[in-house]
């Protein structure tokens, strides 16, 4: 039902959902710190623009008694319960930040009259695509899918001379929230990825994965999985791997690969890691000092959510426009704003654009090296290392089907 918004007369409130069930197991205190740091920046920017207004955040906590799984499994009801709590207290702000779980975002979007914008650090699933008042500040599954299709089709690079049309996808159900939805998108029979591939099989058991590594009758040389190097090692160990196997390890929110002293373990030599660009590193910033590489992206998305709201508020106030209108709710897309770590671009559907980076392990240096980058905004691949020191024959990626000639 319609809830009055605390969003006028020079006072603008942000409702931040602090849910027990979250895409990443981040202490809520750290998210509060990120939000508060964002508020300080927004207040400064508004003041500099000569806008004498008040911006505050209200943190809405769920009781944690019923919904205490800690992951996203019971988030659907928790999100709706929190909305009910907001409704009963008549405490809705100009914008809702959170939730991060796909289930809860989807349900909240469905069950409410969304005349206010919703900003999410997460909501990775395809079911949250193309939502008119939803903005997602962490790369959603759709962006990953578009990269993979683009990369599979590429056949004109010195190191990739074959188009691929096949793949195995390893998905055992124990994935983190981001990985769950990324793999879910690849598995879905109606998705763009499935539509563009001629063959795709999901491997659900460890043994299935392990058997494929040396199976002469395998239908594809390419296996996509999601997680970190340790996750791969647990599964693969030191098993022998056929020389034309390529494992694509999706590990978007982990910038450890770019740290100076990191050496790639031997079991990573058949692996291409897909991660996000480190951008202008946040390692030394006050807000990120106590966060792990993955958590940094999550907390940063909360902080950037606040900065995005500040950006939109400034534009609407300068134009003398009302904040509590559908126009405001639908405006959080197709724009660039000053994020904490430089400009952040949102696409036509309010989803963050980024640069994905494909890394390989150099057989010479045992270091991770950038093979290519992919700009989600223009759906374009940029080769970086034209003569990679691969483990694969002739320093070229193999064909996806053993024994098949040039495509």
């Amino acid at each position: 039902s319609q809830v009055s918004q605390n969003c006028h007369n020079g006072s603008y409130e942000i409702s931040v959902l602090m849910m027990g069930n979250s895409a990443f197991a981040e202490p809520l205190k750290n998210l509060e710190d990120a939000v508060n740091e964002g508020l300080e920046i927004v207040r400064g920017r508004l003041q500099n623009a000569g806008l004498n207004v008040t911006v505050n955040a209200t943190f809405m906590y769920s009781d944690g008694l019923i919904h205490n799984s800690g992951d996203c499994r019971s988030s659907t009801c928790e999100g709706l319960d929190l909305l009910r709590k907001i409704s009963n207290a008549q405490r809705m702000g100009c914008v809702l930040i959170g939730p991060s779980c796909t289930y809860s975002t989807f349900q909240m979007y469905l069950d409410t009259e969304l005349s206010y914008p919703m900003i999410s650090a997460g909501s990775f699933g395809l079911s949250c695509d193309y939502k008119e008042t939803l903005t997602r500040l962490m790369s959603p599954a759709r962006k990953l899918m578009y990269f993979l299709v683009n990369f599979w089709k590429t056949n004109d690079l010195p190191f990739k001379t074959y188009s691929w049309s096949t793949s195995y996808v390893y998905k055992n159900g124990t994935e983190t929230e981001d990985c769950f939805w990324y793999l879910n998108a690849l598995e879905a029979s109606v998705s763009y990825f499935s539509h563009e591939l001629g063959f795709k099989v999901v491997l659900r058991q460890d043994k299935e994965f392990q058997d494929i590594l040396m199976d002469h009758n395998r239908k594809s040389n390419v296996i996509i999985m999601c997680g970190g190097p340790e996750f791969l090692y647990k599964l693969k160990g030191d098993r022998a791997v056929a020389e034309d196997i390529v494992i694509i390890l999706v590990d978007l929110f982990n910038d450890q690969y770019f740290e100076d002293n990191v050496t790639a373990p031997d079991y990573m030599k058949n692996v291409l890691v897909l991660t996000l660009s480190p951008g202008n590193s946040l390692l030394n910033s006050s807000f990120s000092r106590n966060l792990s590489p993955t958590k940094r992206d999550f907390a940063l998305a909360y902080l950037n959510g606040i900065l995005l709201f500040g950006h939109m508020l400034k534009i609407f106030l300068e134009n003398g426009e009302n904040i509590t209108t559908p126009k405001f709710a639908h405006a959080f897309r197709n724009l660039t704003f000053e994020g904490y770590d430089g400009p952040v671009t949102l696409d036509d559907w309010g989803d963050v654009d980024s640069t994905m980076v494909l890394l390989y392990t150099s057989v010479d240096t045992k270091k991770y090296k950038v093979l290519l980058t992919y700009d989600t905004h223009v759906n374009k691949t940029y080769p970086v290392d034209m003569s990679p020191t691969f483990t694969w024959k002739n320093s070229k990626l193999p064909n996806d089907i053993t024994g098949r000639g040039p495509q």
Epitope: N280, L335, T345, D375, H377, V378
Partner: antibody
Framework: EVQLVQSGAEVKKPGSSVKVSCKAS????????ISWVRQAPGQGLEWMGG????????NYAQKFQGRVTITADESTSTAYMELSSLRSEDTAVYYC?????????????????WGQGTMVTVSS | DIQMTQSPSSMSASVGDRVTITCRAS??????LNWYQQLPGNAPTLLIY???NLQSGVPSRFSGSGSGTDFTLTISSLQPDDFATYYC?????????FGQGTKVEIK
């Protein structure tokens, strides 16, 4: 506050080369691209090329391909632009400019810090 | 290469006037359009990036709009410091290209 300081004015003979330096201070050099832009007397701005750290190599406008070389020395936070086979129409002010590019892409958000410019005169 | 065309190439205006300069790209550049101001004898300075974002420290009388191929720079109330040459520039792909410039002179 980031500053770009360029080397001093040069007078060159046709057919010779010129090398202009651009030293950055007060910021992270490798987090940005450096572009070189020139402006002939009374004319508009012309992008010559730039160097983006992640790609390592420089990119050049077709017009200058083969004549211009852009390099960067991260240890001294200095970028260089060398133009060879000079002709009288190369007489111009040459600017270096910090370019806020998108990491791993060629898209950018503008050139937000400029050097003071280096006047290069080509005359026999 | 993407061609950038500015209009007018020069104009006369008075202090307090509202000034509009347009820039057209030969193909769609999304919102990757930047505006620069160049005072005589000085290096250019960035005013607006990504079509409509005001660069830090730039007065709010400057604003930008547009996407695709057509863009506008507006100065809501011209000040004495604003008599200069203005350039648009696309930064979606290499080579980055500039418009030919618009000179704003005192009427």
């Amino acid at each position: 506050e980031v500053q770009l300081v360029q080397s001093g004015a040069e007078v060159k003979k046709p057919g010779s080369s010129v090398k202009v330096s651009c030293k950055a201070s007060g910021g992270t050099f490798s987090s940005y691209a450096i572009s070189w832009v020139r402006q002939a007397p009374g004319q508009g701005l012309e992008w010559m090329g730039g160097i983006i750290p992640i790609f390592g190599t420089a990119n050049y406008a077709q017009k200058f391909q083969g004549r211009v070389t852009i390099t960067a020395d991260e240890s001294t936070s200095t970028a260089y632009m060398e133009l060879s086979s000079l002709r009288s129409e190369d007489t111009a002010v040459y600017y270096c400019a910090r370019t806020r590019y998108i990491w791993g892409s060629y898209r950018a958000y503008g050139m937000d810090v400029w050097g003071q410019g280096t006047m290069v005169t080509v005359s026999s | 290469d993407i061609q950038m065309t500015q209009s007018p190439s020069s104009m006369s205006a008075s202090v307090g006037d509202r000034v509009t300069i347009t820039c057209r790209a030969s193909q769609s550049i999304s919102s990757h359009l930047n505006w620069y101001q160049q005072l005589p004898g000085n290096a250019p300075t960035l005013l607006i990036y990504y079509a409509s974002n005001l660069q830090s420290g730039v007065p709010s009388r400057f604003s930008g709009s547009g996407s695709g191929t057509d863009f506008t720079l507006t100065i809501s109330s011209l000040q004495p410091d604003d008599f200069a040459t203005y350039y648009c520039q696309q930064s979606i792909s290499l080579p980055y290209t500039f418009g030919q410039g618009t000179k704003v002179e005192i009427k």
